[in-house]
Interface confidence: low
């Protein structure tokens, strides 16, 4: 999902895919977002390091798990790519950096009266990527008011130096602010000459053009179609540049298509993603995952939601289909483009929509305002252990949350079954994000057995824990997999990154939410919690969480759901949402069943006949 937080004084260790110099962490994050493999980045400001070579260093990183170990480094800033962040994705960077000289190839010098004018000149020059401007107080008089237009092989500075009375910045062409204008024409049967800056495989000239638009040095392109005479060059997209900024020559050539970068378009740029689906085409690449889904659109959505997936092939071969679902091959490559494109197949292929600015709210989770009290929308696969416990009497409704802890086991709160102990009225939905997606055809699990803690009493807060054994085991997928349980009697770990999730009320007298909500809540000591609940006994088998000022909390409908904390890169189930005085009230934290205190009970109840525990433990 979309992760926007930055980590101060932290540096991700390992996983490097590229490095460059950038003036700040935000620009580094943008470069990570647009790099096909980058999921994480670390940035070293000038103040964070003595090594001149590493100052302003931006390190782009990939990770199979989506995370990397963080090491403490004073001044360093780390964070996540903004892939999947919808409208936050932009190559536009307007900031001006004072006291900084961004080095590159100086290809044009002129006198201007302000840094804004210098930026405008860069934006209106087809080859300019960034610029430096010497102010009127620069120490060498002959350089004052100089505007230096620059470029570099990678589009980022070749070095960045701290230099008084110099201001630097980037071209605003990616902001669609260029005065140059663009050529939308696509030229059939025409090949452009000049310098090739990159070569990728694309299914058509339009994908080639979009890649050219977002490549730092591509000004125009030539695409060789799938019927081009030389087989090894079919579907090749050649990204090109020239000294003049336009092709120096063009040659009539059957089965080639040429065109220009659209970076100089005014007001609108193409989205940095490719939404078209190509029937009868297979995209080759490194296998990330294979999953059975219903329909090519669902395959594309699955690829989009799996952040490392770049492109996919949905196979309609009879051997790749089971009933109405067929195999969805999720793939990636070094450059984000297929390594092979095959035609006349029984597949359909396309690209991840992770870089689309618009699209479903399920991909970008920043638009809705009513939620779990003080929370935000979750995204697909973010909390794959979360389940919805629903009761089907005449109508069907969501009553509680729960956590998948094994193929056939769900952990929830005992009070969810108060007055509803009949297992056949319950339906358990896993691997879902939006409750509105549930139709009469959505698969659900039925309950084989409800195991309520033997010491639980209705209307008492103690031992509010229950296990559900499902009638049939669930397969694990990216969207449906278990949460690890804590170690028995885990009291020494200090958890600082804890989250509560659920579809519960967004206010005390609210209603069930459609999109799974998440809220980051700090743990509160039991002593502090007891002070807030003097009429109740807060036992060591409970854990409390909440903000002193209130405003963020679990609420009705979240009961039974998880309180999870991330520690050393691993999520653990620390608590089960149990009770509280109202929702998100000031100085009234939420009270959760402390899972670590019930590990013996959980192990005993989930023990299979062969003596192996049927749930996940981080042991």
């Amino acid at each position: 999902g979309c992760l926007t937080q930055l980590y101060e004084n932290a540096f991700f260790r390992g996983g490097d895919v590229a490095s460059m110099y950038t003036p700040n962490a935000q620009y580094c994050q943008m470069r990570c977002t647009f790099h096909p493999r980058c999921l994480l980045f670390s940035f070293l400001p000038a103040s964070s390091i003595n090594d001149m070579e590493k100052r302003f260093g931006c390190f782009l990183k990939d990770s199979v798990t989506g995370t990397l170990p963080k090491v403490h480094r004073t001044g360093a800033v780390s964070g996540h790519s903004l892939k999947q962040c919808g409208h936050q994705i932009s190559a536009c960077h307007r900031d001006i950096y004072k006291g900084v000289d961004m080095r590159g190839v100086n290809f044009n010098v002129s006198k201007v009266s302000s840094v804004e004018e210098c930026q405008k000149r860069c934006t209106s020059n087809i080859r300019c990527q960034f610029f430096s401007y010497a102010t009127q107080t620069f120490h060498k008089a002959e350089y004052r008011n100089n505007c230096l237009l620059k470029y570099s092989p990678g589009g980022t500075p070749t070095a960045i130096k701290v230099l008084s009375n110099v201001e630097s910045g980037f071209s605003l062409k990616p902001c669609a602010l260029s005065e140059i204008g663009c050529h939308m024409n696509i030229f059939q049967h025409l090949a452009f000459s000049d310098v090739d800056v990159a070569r990728v495989l694309t299914p058509d000239a339009f994908v080639c053009r979009t890649i050219c638009t977002y490549h730092p040095n591509c000004l125009f392109f030539t695409f060789y179609t799938n019927v081009w005479k030389i087989e090894s060059q079919r579907n090749v997209c050649l990204l090109k540049t020239s000294e003049s900024g336009t092709p120096s020559s063009s040659t009539p050539q059957e089965n080639t298509i040429s065109g220009y970068s659209l970076l100089t378009c005014k007001r609108t740029l193409p989205e940095p993603c490719h939404s078209k689906i190509y029937p009868g085409v297979d995209f080759g690449g490194e296998e990330l995952n294979v999953t059975f889904v219903k329909g090519v659109n669902v395959c594309q959505e699955t690829c989009t939601k799996m952040i490392r997936c770049q492109f996919f092939t949905y196979s309609l071969l009879p051997e790749d289909c089971k009933e109405e679902k067929c195999k969805c091959f999720l793939r990636l490559s070094m450059d984000g483009s297929p390594t092979r494109i095959a035609y006349g197949t029984q597949g359909s292929s396309g690209y991840s929509l992770r870089l689309c600015n618009t699209g479903d709210n399920s991909v970008c989770t920043t638009k809705t305002s009513t939620r779990i009290v003080g929370g935000t929308n979750s995204s697909w696969g973010e909390w794959p252990w979360q389940v919805s416990l629903q009761v089907k009497l005449t109508a069907q409704r969501h009553l509680c949350g729960g956590s998948l802890i094994g193929h056939q086991w769900v952990l929830t709160a005992a009070h969810c079954f108060d007055g509803l102990p009949l297992q056949d009225v319950w339906r358990i939905y896993s691997g879902i994000l939006n409750l509105s997606d549930i139709t009469k055809d959505t698969p659900f699990s039925q309950i084989k057995e409800i195991i309520i803690h033997q010491n639980y009493k209705v209307s008492e807060g103690n031992h509010d824990i229950a296990l559900i054994k499902l009638q049939a085991p669930l397969n694990y997928t990216e969207f449906q997999k278990p949460i690890c349980l804590p170690s028995k009697g885990d009291t020494s770990t200090i958890y600082t990154n804890c989250w509560v999730t659920g579809w519960g009320f967004s206010k005390e007298k609210g209603e069930i939410q459609n999109i799974l909500q998440k809220v980051n809540i700090p743990l509160v000591t039991n002593e502090e919690c007891q002070k807030r609940y003097q009429d109740y006994k807060i036992t060591q088998r409970m854990v409390c969480a909440g903000y002193k000022e209130g405003g963020k909390d679990a609420c009705k409908g979240d009961s039974g759901g998880p309180l999870v904390c991330k520690h050393n890169g691993m999520w653990r189930l620390v608590g089960i949402t149990s009770w509280g005085e109202g929702c998100a009230r000031r100085e009234q934290p939420g009270v959760y069943t402390k899972v670590a205190e019930y590990m013996d009970w959980i192990l005993e109840k989930t023990q299979s006949s062969d003596g192996k525990a049927q749930m996940q433990s981080p042991a």
């Epitope: 219903k294 090519v296 109405e324 139709t439």
Partner: antibody, heavy 120, light 107 residues
């Protein structure tokens, strides 16, 4: 050539029954989901029923549920719609249509239709 | 059930004009929106599926856009054969529902 050909329509009295057939050719019928869509004279399109490739799952519009049954015989490349307890409001042109996962379950191939008239 | 509302219900235009038909879903249907053309006495024909993908053989003057609840069908440079009825349809969840249709007439 990919083709769907409906048959079995006609005039029937209210309460009566009719069985529509749809013969498929030019594609591997057993791979595809199929459906029926109807259009009352001078009116818009209404989805009636749908069946998965194996025949194991069928879905119906509320207006026909319990009265109509969709089925298929993959060995004969034929789709059927058994219509019982017919009412005047069932009078319509009935189209059989193919839906495919590659088009997000859009109806990409349609038959020419067969007219069903329910009248006394 | 998901309701599909098409507007306008009828539209007058001339050959060579550009027209836009809109379709609104009563709840989000992602991009599972299809457009059909129906000529008098004929079966409907698929024009666009998945909101914006042109069906093979359909002229490029037809285009579709939108996601979530709001969608549009645009026809640039109207041809005489385009003056017929257009329907939108959602294939997001059953029952699959159609819009009431838009009749495109010659001015």
């Amino acid at each position: 050539e990919v083709q769907l050909l409906e048959s079995g329509g006609g005039l029937v009295q209210p309460g009566g029954s009719l069985r529509l057939s749809c013969a498929a050719s030019g594609f591997t019928f057993s791979w595809y989901y199929m459906g029926w869509v109807r259009q009352a004279p001078g009116k818009g399109l209404e989805w009636v029923s749908w069946i998965v490739s194996s025949g194991g799952l069928t879905l119906y519009a509320d207006s026909v549920k319990g009265r109509f049954t969709i089925s298929r015989d993959n060995s004969k490349n034929t789709l059927y719609l058994q219509m019982n307890s017919l009412r005047a409001e069932d009078t319509a042109m009935y189209y059989c249509a193919r839906t495919t996962v590659t088009t997000g379950d859009a109806f990409d191939i349609w038959g020419q239709g067969t007219m069903v008239t329910v009248s006394s | 059930d998901i309701q599909m509302t098409q507007s306008p219900s009828s539209l007058s235009a001339s050959v060579g004009d550009r027209v836009t038909i809109t379709c609104r879903a009563s709840q989000s249907i992602s991009r599972y929106l299809n457009w059909y053309q129906q000529k008098p006495g004929k079966a409907p024909k698929l024009l666009i599926y998945a909101a914006s993908t042109l069906e093979t053989g359909v002229p490029s003057r037809f285009s579709g856009s939108g996601s979530g609840t709001d969608f549009t069908l645009t026809i640039t440079t109207l041809q005489p054969e385009d003056f017929v009825i257009y329907y939108c349809q959602q294939s997001y969840s059953t029952p699959y529902t159609f819009g009431q249709g838009t009749k495109l007439e010659i001015k």
